[in-house]
């Protein structure tokens, strides 16, 4: 699909409407200009055309007024003031505080642990196909064939770590060269970055809180994604990374350190390993060729086990097959040696809910997988809504000018330099990358923090992670301490590399504008987020992995030609905005191409279709919980529900629970009061610290 | 307790055959391997060869392969060697043995031994 | 096959004395190695095995060491009834081998 053109600061008729055009939308006004409104009016933008940016017709059809769609939202403060409060008012307005932190902490606690139990279904689910993966020979011959091993495992188990300290102990058993690891390292960056992606997704109710969300998740992976574009070429050509670590690795004298602190997981472990415990060295042994482990299940059964050191006779069919000449002998018909055998006598069984279930591993995972999602949505759905009721009027204001203000001239460059050191500390404490950026995404989502700030946090979490396998790296044994250094420092000195090419210089950070020009095509067809998270990490990956079993040739016979079209897209669109003159009148704008592949609207016309027959059967149930919900939160006209029930209650005749359009949803409050049913002072339901 | 009852002495010409008997008792016969060794007169011990009774494998010096066979019959706990074309230096005690210590050349239980004299 | 070298081939001492007998494997053998005593016209009596484990029976005075390709046989204290010809025996490799055998006699 040919990309849309992006216009200038020319903003074109709104009936005349450019997808994708990062920053271009508009989009539904600012909720706090609000008026009473049951449609659900998407953007007032529908129709599309296709504008070339030098047309007069972008300049004359000026709206009067446009809103930033990537402006942060203003959180009205719809509460009593403190110092307007009586003593009652002041003791009952500390305790819902101090009640709203406690249920934030335990939300968030929650999502991280939900993220962990995510982590272990994934594993259940797709680990040994993961562990497989690896072993494949071509990994060491073909950069490409490990980037997107790297990348699809790490998917699959969800966690770079895993997939990192398998490259590791196969580097260590020399199965694997530091110079093939690099790429798999480089792979599993990308693929550490669809956690939030997933997070993001989670707020798809909201569509502007969608679209901030999804580009704040996003801008991770389009760093990673970019990053390697460059330096995977790079790195094959001169070998830079493999050159500079090695280099580090054998200038330093490292002696064993200690273990990287496990930070959060003291506090996470206690919950997650009570849902479920995994072994997670069967992945690695797939990984390594083991054939027994592939019938090994990933679900920890024994927790307490007593090995045994034990030399063992064996025979063997000759002399030559001994342990050692010293170690050989004969009965007079067999020849026998001494083998080491580890005997394993089970002690004590773990206490996890699967342990006594003898269910497949695909089984556990997927009902961890449901749960683990259920479990995310919901807390992050709760996160979202405290954080909403808490950062309001002056509490938002201080807050979002803390994290969003820069230093005062000349220091405002040091900033986002800053914010990279403040990723990469938050992400060391809570040991994670994924936790951090995911934990991120909704602050992005409701407004809390720009983009251009989470994307130097992104920066510094990808750093962050880097530094936890440092750690990790000097407490490894003898043999595996200069790999898995050497490895870690790969991925450090890739993540450096990356910073120093899409951050320094403003006019290089890409993955904002990437970031951004995907919110605004999710934000208006939002079942485009799922197929970018489809096709970004599996379907390409996917394509690859078979291209490069089928051999460099085809690979090579294929991927030419895919190449040479996406650059001749990427030239003609530059030409088309930068200097259009030069280009056949056919070949200004994409008009010349049909409908399909310059819009994305017949797409949207077909995915409705495929979806409109559920729509019928999910609004019966949507309209239940919707209105259980409503009880619950004692607003019988606040109901959140999805475009469909609303199509149907207004189908039906005496309709008494008025629906909302889902992307102007905010707190409760300032919907009700949007809609003039409660007074701005009602203390009942808000309560402001400030 | 563990006996081994080996057949009588022979007097055998140059070039003939003899097969010897050792008859096992006190333990289950197919555990253990069975060692056959041979004393020349005045002389040190000389490892023929071995059987494992349970599977029928066979072992065997080389010096002396192509001329000796050991057999086995699980039925009547019976070792037998067959020693052919048979020469003036063959001369000796030939002594059936089996090894309790398992998965060791070391035997421990010995039969008294069967003389083989080899005069024309 | 492995040559097993015994020296001496024969010694005479006195009752109470110790007697060391040593056995050459020709080449490393670890420590499969067995010996026998064996007395006039009787069949040869397992002694030692895996180069220093008595068998069921041995008294004391018998003791083996070595390893690789040196072992030898020690009788702490000789008595009477130790009147013999002693044997080493490699089972290290097929064929198992005999040492030549000392003549242990008493003065």
């Known amino acids: 699909m040919a990309p849309w053109p992006e216009l200038g600061d020319a903003q074109p008729n709104p009936d005349k409407y450019l997808e994708g055009a990062a920053g271009q939308q508009p989009t539904a006004p600012d909720k706090s200009k609000e008026t009473n409104k049951t449609d659900n009016t998407e953007a007032p933008v529908t129709k599309i055309e296709l504008l070339p940016s030098y047309s007069t017709a972008t300049l004359i059809d000026e709206p009067t007024e446009v809103d930033d769609p990537w402006n942060l939202p203003t959180l009205q403060d719809s509460g009593i003031k403190w110092s307007e409060r009586d003593t009652k008012g002041k003791i009952l307005c500390f305790f819902q505080g101090i009640g709203r932190l406690i249920l934030l902490l335990g939300f968030l606690y929650f999502f991280v642990c939900s993220l962990d139990i995510l982590s272990s279904a994934f594993q259940l689910v797709g680990g040994k196909m993961a562990g497989q993966f690896f072993s494949n020979s071509s990994i060491m011959s073909n950069p490409l064939l490990g980037l997107v091993i790297g990348v699809l495992v790490t998917v699959l188990v969800q966690s770079s770590s895993t997939s990192t300290s398998i490259v590791v102990s196969m580097v260590s058993s020399s199965l694997l060269t530091v110079r093939a690891a690099i790429p798999i390292i480089m792979g599993a960056n990308i693929g550490t970055s669809i956690t939030n992606t997933i997070v993001a997704l989670m707020q798809v109710g909201d569509r502007s809180e969608f679209r901030r969300a999804f580009a704040g998740a996003t801008v991770h992976d389009f760093f990673n994604w970019l990053s390697v574009l460059v330096l995977l070429p790079v790195e094959v050509a001169t070998h830079y990374l493999e050159i500079i670590t090695q280099l580090i690795v054998e200038s330093f004298h490292f002696k064993n350190g200690e273990d990287a602190p496990d930070l959060l997981k003291v506090i996470t472990k206690p919950f997650t390993k009570l849902i479920v415990q995994l072994d997670k060295k069967v992945i690695s042994q797939i990984a390594m060729n083991d054939e027994k482990a592939k019938n090994k299940s990933l679900v920890k059964i024994w927790c307490k086990t007593f090995t045994n050191k034990t030399q063992i006779n064996v025979t063997v069919p000759s002399t030559a097959n001994c342990t050692s000449p010293s170690l050989c002998w004969t009965d007079g018909i067999q020849n026998w040696t001494m083998k080491n055998v580890t005997y394993k006598e089970n002690i004590a069984k773990c206490q996890h809910i699967f342990v006594n279930f003898h269910l497949p591993d695909l089984a556990v995972g997927t009902i961890l997988l449901i749960l683990s999602l259920l479990v995310l949505c919901g807390c992050l759905i709760m996160i979202v809504k405290i954080l909403g009721s808490v950062l309001k009027g002056q509490v938002a204001t201080v807050i979002k000018k803390t994290i969003n203000t820069d230093f005062p001239f000349p220091f405002a460059w040091l900033t986002g330099y800053l914010a990279i050191l403040v990723g990469a500390g938050m992400t060391f404490i809570v040991q994670s990358s994924s936790v951090f950026t995911s934990a991120l995404t909704p602050l992005i989502g409701i407004g809390v923090i720009t983009i251009e700030r989470a994307y130097p946090l992104t920066l510094g979490s990808n750093i962050g992670t880097t530094t936890t396998a440092i750690l990790a790296a000097l407490a490894s044994p003898g043999n595996a301490l200069r790999s898995s250094l050497q490895i870690a420092l790969c991925h450090f000195f890739f993540n450096i590399s990356g910073i120093l090419l899409w951050y320094p210089i403003p006019f290089t950070r890409l993955p904002i504008r990437m970031a951004k020009g995907l919110g605004n095509i999710s934000a208006k067809y939002r079942w485009f987020a799922v197929f970018y998270l489809i096709i970004f990490f599996f379907l390409i990956p996917l394509t690859v992995f078979g291209l490069s079993l089928a051999g460099w040739r085809v690979l090579v016979g294929v991927g030419v030609p895919v190449v040479f079209i996406i650059i001749l897209v990427l030239c003609l669109r530059l030409l088309q905005s930068r200097c259009p003159r030069v280009l056949p009148k056919k070949l200004q704008n994409w008009n010349f191409l049909p409908l399909w592949m310059r819009s994305l609207k017949p797409w949207d016309a077909v995915v409705s279709k495929f979806t409109g027959c559920f729509q019928m059967r999910c609004c019966c149930c949507c309209r239940v919980c919707c209105r259980a919900c409503c009880l619950l939160c004692d607003c019988p006209k606040c109901c959140r529900c999805s475009k469909c029930c609303e199509d149907l209650e207004e189908a039906q005749e005496g309709q008494d629970v008025p629906v909302k359009a889902p992307e102007t949803f905010d707190n409760i409050t300032i919907s009700r009061e949007a809609q003039g049913e409660v007074p701005a002072s009602d203390s009942k339901t808000e309560c402001t610290a400030l | 307790q563990v006996q081994l009852v080996q057949s009588g002495a022979e007097v055998v010409k140059p070039g003939a055959s003899v097969k010897m008997s050792c008859k096992t008792s006190?333990?289950?016969?197919?555990?253990?391997?069975m060692h056959w060794v041979r004393q020349a007169p005045g002389q040190g011990l000389e490892w023929i060869g071995a059987?494992?009774?349970?599977?029928?494998?066979?072992s065997y010096n080389q010096k002396f392969k192509g001329r000796v066979t050991l057999t086995a019959d699980k039925s009547t706990s019976t070792a037998y060697m067959e020693l052919s074309s048979l020469r003036s230096e063959d001369t000796a005690v030939y002594y059936c043995?089996?090894?309790?210590?398992?998965?060791?050349?070391?035997?421990?239980?010995w039969g008294q031994g069967t003389l083989v004299t080899v005069s024309s | 096959d492995i040559q097993m070298t015994q020296s001496p081939s024969s010694l005479s001492t006195s009752v109470g004395d110790r007697v060391t007998i040593t056995c050459k494997a020709s080449?490393?053998?670890?420590?499969?190695v067995a010996w026998y005593q064996q007395k006039p016209g009787k069949s040869p009596k397992l002694l030692i095995y895996?180069?220093?484990t008595r068998h069921t029976g041995v008294p004391s005075r018998f003791s083996g060491s070595g390893s690789g390709t040196d072992f030898t046989l020690i009788i702490s204290s000789l008595q009477p009834e130790d009147v013999a010809t002693y044997y080493c025996?490699?089972?290290?490799?097929?064929?198992?081998?005999f040492g030549g055998g000392t003549k242990v006699e008493i003065k």
């Open positions: 043995s089996i090894s309790t210590i398992i998965t060791t050349g070391a035997v421990d239980y």
């Open positions: 006190g333990y289950t016969f197919i555990t253990y391997n």
């Open positions: 059987i494992y009774p349970g599977s029928g494998d066979t």
């Open positions: 080449q490393d053998v670890g420590t499969a």
């Open positions: 895996w180069t220093s």
């Open positions: 025996q490699q089972y290290s490799r097929i064929p198992l081998t």
